[in-house]
Interface confidence: low
């Protein structure tokens, strides 16, 4: 789970070691602040839970790619 170190910066200190199904994911943010110890991706699940993940892992990249493509598909 991400920690807010102040109002502006949210950091990840540990990454999930479990792959999350893309069906459970709603969105993501890429955290790039040097105030944080790690470059990270924060996934938000469909139940609004935030999960820290390692952007170097292929499943994380695939999940971001999936969410990117999802936003290009008009909702009917």
């Amino acid at each position: 789970q991400p920690d807010a170190i102040n109002a502006a910066v949210t950091c990840c200190y540990n990454f999930t070691n479990r792959k999350i199904s893309v069906q459970r994911l709603a969105s993501y943010r890429r955290i790039t602040s040097s105030k944080c110890p790690k470059e990270a991706v924060i996934f938000k699940t469909i139940v609004a839970k935030e999960i820290c993940a390692d952007p170097k892992q292929k499943w994380v990249q695939d999940s971001m790619d999936h969410l990117d493509k999802q936003t290009q598909t008009p909702k009917t």
């Epitope: 502006a8 910066v9 949210t10 969105s27 993501y28 943010r29 890429r30 955290i31 790039t32 602040s33 040097s34 105030k35 790690k38 470059e39 170097k56 990249q61 971001m64 790619d65 969410l67 990117d68 493509k69 936003t71 290009q72």
Partner: antibody, heavy 116, light 111 residues
Framework: QSLEESGGDLVKPGASLTLTCTAS??????ICWVRQAPGKGLEWIAC????????TYYASWAKGRFTVSKTSSTTVTLQMTSLTAADTATYFC????????????WGPGTLVTVSS | ALVMTQTPSSVSAAVGGTVTINCQAS???????MAWYQQKPGQPPKLLIY???SLASGVPSHFRGSGSGTQFTLTISDLESDDAATYYC????????????FGGGTEVVVK
């Protein structure tokens, strides 16, 4: 907190040039390069991660001819090759915000003129 | 590439008036990753708005960003002479196409 670009010059077509962006603090976020031709709009070139990963991202048109590198804890360079008149512009370095999606701090810019 | 179409290219309004600048993205902007910048002659751009509607630190509240998806708007109300500048929108297209796209700019003239 500040950024400053240096290395802008008048060069001939086909030449190479390296620009440097210096940050006032060791602690910067991600550094990106953006250029602006005289009287024109802004054009993104590339970004590099300030963390140990040093991840790089390039505009599709810039791949191969432009190279962004982190040369020290406070400096980032932009190497440009095979310059043409179309590369004449003010080159800005900018720091991203807490996320990768916007630039919260800009340098004053350095002018590159490519002319024979 | 993410192409941002900004309109109008120039707009003139009186002090105290309101100006609206529109920006249309060629693709949906993920998570509303849209920013607005102000640039004055001889100066670098200055961040005004990020994530479509969040006001950057130190920016007066008469600047307002709105919109989502492909359509975004910057509204400047209670126009001041100091607001005379060129304004740029900038969208970020996310992981699968790491590109920033800038709009062509809108010159705001304050009468």
């Amino acid at each position: 907190q500040s950024l400053e670009e240096s290395g802008g010059d008048l060069v001939k077509p086909g030449a190479s040039l390296t620009l440097t962006c210096t940050a006032s603090e060791l602690d910067f976020y991600w550094i990106c390069w953006v250029r602006q031709a005289p009287g024109k709009g802004l054009e993104w070139i590339a970004c590099i991660g300030a963390g140990s990963s040093g991840s790089t991202y390039y505009a599709s048109w810039a791949k191969g001819r432009f190279t962004v590198s982190k040369t020290s804890s406070t400096t980032v360079t932009l190497q440009m090759t095979s310059l043409t008149a179309a590369d004449t512009a003010t080159y800005f370095c900018a720091r991203t915000g807490t996320e990768f999606t916007y630039y919260s701090l800009w340098g004053p810019g350095t002018l590159v003129t490519v002319s024979s | 590439a993410l192409v941002m179409t900004q309109t109008p290219s120039s707009v003139s309004a009186a002090v105290g008036g309101t100006v609206t600048i529109n920006c249309q993205a060629s693709q949906s902007v993920y998570n509303n990753n849209m920013a607005w910048y102000q640039q004055k002659p001889g100066q670098p751009p200055k961040l005004l708005i990020y994530t479509a509607s969040s006001l950057a630190s130190g920016v007066p509240s008469h600047f307002r960003g709105s919109g989502s998806g492909t359509q975004f708007t910057l509204t400047i109300s209670d126009l001041e002479s100091d607001d005379a500048a060129t304004y740029y929108c900038a969208g970020y297209k996310s992981y699968s196409n790491d590109e920033y796209g800038f709009g062509g700019g809108t010159e705001v003239v304050v009468k």
